[in-house]
Amino acid sequence: SQPQAVPPYASENQTCRDQEKEYYEPQHRICCSRCPPGTYVSAKCSRIRDTVCATCAENSYNEHWNYLTICQLCRPCDPVMGLEEIAPCTSKRKTQCRCQPGMFCAAWALECTHCELLSDCPPGTEAELKDEVGKGNNHCVPCKAGHFQNTSSPSARCQPHTRCENQGLVEAAPGTAQSDTTCKNPLEPLPPEMSGTMLM
């Protein structure tokens, strides 16, 4: 088998063997090495010398195999836009940002650029759980049977109704989607407004 060409090597059809790690240099009609993530081109290739790469300086990065002559500047997550940092910038990766708690991504351009406050879910509902936090605004769904939620909140969860018997009490008023069960001591009389429903 023929030995594999090592950059720089001639390419008549303007394509290179390894598209990820090599690029076509039209001036010399050769394939040259790209620089790995975290580095940039400090000296361009020639017919007799391959690309020379150097590590990105502090506060700069290149995420991919590249033939860039500079590194990209690290940018902080902008708190004014509702973003917070989850991992810092390194030479191989831009700063990783996400929406702050209680916010969702309202503007997306390759990455989230602007977050807004999540909408409140009214009493009797809760926010549908999403696969990824901060991806979209709340979609409020009714509490399932036997559960309640009594606030207007972006994050409150429906809670199970109290079971009076578990506390040695009896039910004075049933729970609804917006309120918990009301319990009372079994020896206490019913409140006046409910006395009409009692069997004599």
């Epitope: 975290g38 590590t55 300086a57 502090e58 810092p88 910038c89 390194t90």
Partner: antibody, heavy 121, light 107 residues
């Protein structure tokens, strides 16, 4: 030859101090993120501290925060770890490790041989 | 903090065996996962960086895969010099954390 050489380890009493040094050669130290990693006898690896290439970003493990200080001198190709208020649980082999291709923390592709720190009364 | 759980903690294998070690992160770390080999009384050596990239000078029988939370180190055909302890490490964020290690012993 690419290498890191640690020094400064030894026996110290609880509450005492030590200063570890790491001399780098054979690579561009001034563009490399550097770390201290330790290994207690018979245990696994534990990250201690990291410093970015120009020293702007510094991180510590919770277990050493407020007691240890990492620093570097790029003119001398040297990394340091000042260890104060030492405890018995700081007893370990301390390794200097570098990420030659990242100014920040990353995979450590170069390691020193380690220096032993023993904290005992 | 990101916890790294490595399994198994030890294994016995013979020369020529295919060996697989797994590492799980407590949250997504993208592909910021590194594998090291350490022999008794020696410093660790980097084998794999960025989950699947082979460090220069490391034999091609070592390979890494995975992204997100689940990662694997594979030794395709074990050689006598591969009996050692292997550690995974995340470099996604500080505190940088290591797995507990996997000791590969001779059967």
């Amino acid at each position: 030859e690419v290498q890191l050489v640690e020094s400064g380890g030894g026996l110290v009493k609880p509450g005492g101090s030590l200063r570890l040094s790491c001399a780098a050669s054979g690579f561009t130290f001034s563009t490399s993120g550097m770390n201290w990693v330790r290994q207690a006898p018979g245990k696994g690896l534990e990250w201690v501290s990291s410093v970015s290439s120009s020293g702007s970003y510094i991180y510590y493990a919770d277990s050493v925060k407020g007691r240890f200080t990492i620093s570097r001198d790029n003119a001398k190709n040297s990394l340091y770890l000042q260890m104060n208020s030492l405890r018995a649980e700081d007893t370990a082999v301390y390794y200097c490790a570098g990420a030659r291709y990242n100014w920040h923390f990353d995979a450590s592709d170069i390691w020193g041989q380690g220096t032993v720190v023993t904290v005992s009364s | 903090d990101i916890q790294m759980t490595q399994s198994p903690s030890s294994l016995s294998a013979s020369v020529g065996d295919r060996v697989t070690i797994t590492c799980r992160a407590s949250q997504s770390i993208s592909s910021d996962l590194n594998w090291y080999q350490q022999k008794p009384g020696k410093a660790p050596n980097l084998l794999i960086y960025a989950a699947s990239s082979l460090h220069s000078g490391v034999p091609s029988r070592f390979s890494g895969s995975g992204s997100g939370t689940d990662f694997t180190l594979t030794i395709s055909s074990l050689l006598p010099e591969d009996f050692a302890t292997y550690y995974c490490q995340q470099s996604y964020n500080t505190p940088l954390t290591f797995g507990g290690g996997t000791k590969v012993e001779i059967k």
